[in-house]
């Protein structure tokens, strides 16, 4: 009774299609696979960025897999063939592992790469990234930004740079069609006649770096002798009402400061008839139903009521 064996996949490799971190892992079937023609052979693939504690594990019948990686670090991956128990009279058979690595040969010392990279997706409409030049680089150093997300045929270069002293220190992006809820990849590389410049890679999802506009049309309405309803409108733009959280700051008679976080465009405040002055401001942020993270908007303009009975009128800014 001969022991059943299976070979590892052939030519296991990590292919960089030029998408700034979105890589293809691909392989060929093992030799002698047709011994198991009646069986569906599977592959167990493990991969990670070098330095990561944990492997991602995939089991697939395909000969390729695609995922995003941090190209600032190397990548390691391994794969083996799995013969299910149905093919082998009772126990799963695994091949030995085939292993491969990938990294971009770094140019220049780490200090030459851009510093303090910051990207904000203003009002879910306009992406702007800014950075500071690397430490100790000369004024002849220029940085170039490239970006890619699924849906683009190839990586694109920024066409509208923000400049300071002749150096590119930021990028205003064009309209980015169908670019949210997917990984957005950026590479900022550089050139200098003096020394090589280290490239930097960044990955994020646009909906997680949205900074909305502040709310507008703040109003007061007296609901009862001891309740005032504060109301406002969602900021203009493409973000739907269901996507907002709000933070309110209320000041009563220059003394009491109330802060609250709410999900709707209203807030009911308990007051006394003695209240002489009431002011509030509101800011907005994309909530957990629409993103994993976000940036608070600027505060709205302040809306105040002063020295008049709130029951007599609604104050509209």
């Amino acid at each position: 009774d001969t022991e059943i064996k299976v070979n590892p996949p052939q030519d296991f490799e990590i292919v960089d299609p030029g998408y700034l971190g979105y890589l293809y892992l691909q392989w060929q079937p093992p030799l002698s696979l047709d011994h198991f023609k009646e069986c569906t052979v599977e592959y167990e693939l493990k991969y990670r960025n070098i330095g990561s504690e944990t492997w991602k594990t995939i089991i697939t019948k395909n000969l390729h897999y695609k995922d995003g990686f941090d190209l600032n670090k190397g990548i390691e991956a391994k794969i083996h063939t799995l013969l299910p128990w149905q093919c082998t009279n009772g126990s799963e058979v695994q091949s030995s592992w085939a292993e491969t690595t990938y990294w971009i040969s770094p140019q220049g010392i780490p200090e030459t790469k851009v510093q303090d990279m910051d990207c904000v997706y203003y009002n879910w409409q306009y992406l702007l990234c800014s950075w500071k030049p690397g430490i100790g680089v000369l004024l002849d150093t220029n940085y170039n930004l490239f970006y890619w997300y699924e849906g683009l045929d190839h990586a694109l270069q920024c066409v509208d740079y923000i400049k300071a002293d002749g150096q590119n220190i930021g990028c205003r992006f064009p309209y980015l069609e169908a670019s949210d809820y997917k990984d957005f990849y950026i590479c900022v590389n550089g050139s200098s006649e003096n020394k090589p410049i280290r490239s930097s890679y960044f990955t994020f999802q646009l909906q997680n770096i949205v900074k909305p506009l502040p709310p507008v049309y703040l109003t007061f309405t007296r609901e009862s002798s001891c309740e005032i309803k504060l109301k406002w409108s969602i900021p203009l733009g493409p973000i739907p009402a269901r996507c907002f959280d709000y933070e309110i700051e209320i000041r009563e008679d220059d003394t009491t400061l109330v802060t609250a976080t709410v999900e709707n465009e209203t807030y009911t405040l308990k007051t006394t008839n003695e209240t002489r002055q009431l002011c509030f401001v509101v800011r907005s942020k994309v909530n957990i139903y629409c993103s994993d993270d976000g940036i608070w908007s600027e505060w709205s303009d302040k809306q105040c009521w002063e020295g008049e009975d709130l029951s007599k009128k609604t104050l509209l800014r």
Epitope: Q10, D11, E13, I14, V15, P17, Y24, Q26, Q28, P29, L31, S32, L33, D34, H35, L63, H64, T100
Partner: antibody
Framework: QVQLVQSGAEVVKPGASVKLSCKAS????????MSWVRQAPGQGLEWVAT????????YYPESVKGRFTITRDNSTSTLYMEMRSLRSDDTAVYYC???????????WGQGTLVTVSS | DIVMTQSPLSLPVTLGQPASISCKAS??????VAWYQQRPGQSPRALIY???YRYSGVPDRFSGSGSGTDFTLKISRVEAEDVGVFYC?????????FGQGTKLEIK
């Protein structure tokens, strides 16, 4: 349908270099390994080089190692072979071929005649 | 290197009759053998992979068999279009190697 279209015939002097190309269409080029096989006049087939789909792996027989280089450009679906320090016994028809998923060669180009002669 | 030895080197056959070509490997190549046909003035064409599996479009009069070191290509009824040279090839290990070819001609 799968097509492999090779560049035209070459006549070169001994010691010279030449670069052959093979333009692929009708399949996802980057998913397949590719090979070059040659056939000297009146002789049989001789394997010359293989490259993996992503280009990470290259294989050569001893007879051409160090002189021939197989490369590919997946963005243009083109396979290349650069041949240096050519000798008269390199005279042959050179075929590009797609390596199928079992590692055999399932589709072949029309061939390029390379003549090395002084 | 693995040497693939074909026999016979020349095979005259009467139309409609069967033909058989043998290919012996100098060491075990499991089932990792392919067969090719090269008609006069044409590029090679793949017939068989993994010793016994026909490529799509290959007539079922062609069949392959064998494993380890001994392999056979059979043509059940030879037709005029089968004229040419048949090659076996092993892909079990690099360097890939071909047999020297068997020339099939019509008697």
């Amino acid at each position: 349908q799968v097509q492999l279209v090779q560049s035209g015939a070459e006549v070169v002097k001994p010691g010279a270099s030449v670069k052959l190309s093979c333009k692929a269409s009708g399949f996802t080029f980057s998913s397949y390994g590719m090979s070059w096989v040659r056939q000297a006049p009146g002789q049989g087939l001789e394997w010359v080089a293989t490259i993996s789909g992503g280009g990470s792996y290259t294989y050569y027989p001893e007879s051409v190692k160090g002189r021939f280089t197989i490369t590919r450009d997946n963005s243009t679906s083109t396979l290349y072979m650069e041949m240096r320090s050519l000798r008269s016994d390199d005279t042959a028809v050179y075929y590009c071929a797609r390596r199928d998923l079992r590692s055999a060669m399932d589709y072949w180009g029309q061939g390029t005649l390379v003549t090395v002669s002084s | 290197d693995i040497v693939m030895t074909q026999s016979p080197l020349s095979l005259p056959v009467t139309l409609g009759q069967p033909a058989s070509i043998s290919c012996k490997a100098s060491q075990n190549v499991d089932i990792n053998v392919a067969w090719y046909q090269q008609r006069p003035g044409q590029s090679p064409r793949a017939l068989i992979y993994s010793a016994s599996y026909r490529y799509s479009g290959v007539p079922d009069r062609f069949s392959g068999s064998g494993s380890g070191t001994d392999f056979t290509l059979k043509i059940s009824r030879v037709e005029a279009e089968d004229v040419g040279v048949f090659y076996c090839q092993q892909y079990n290990a690099y360097p890939l190697t071909f047999g020297q070819g068997t020339k099939l001609e019509i008697k």
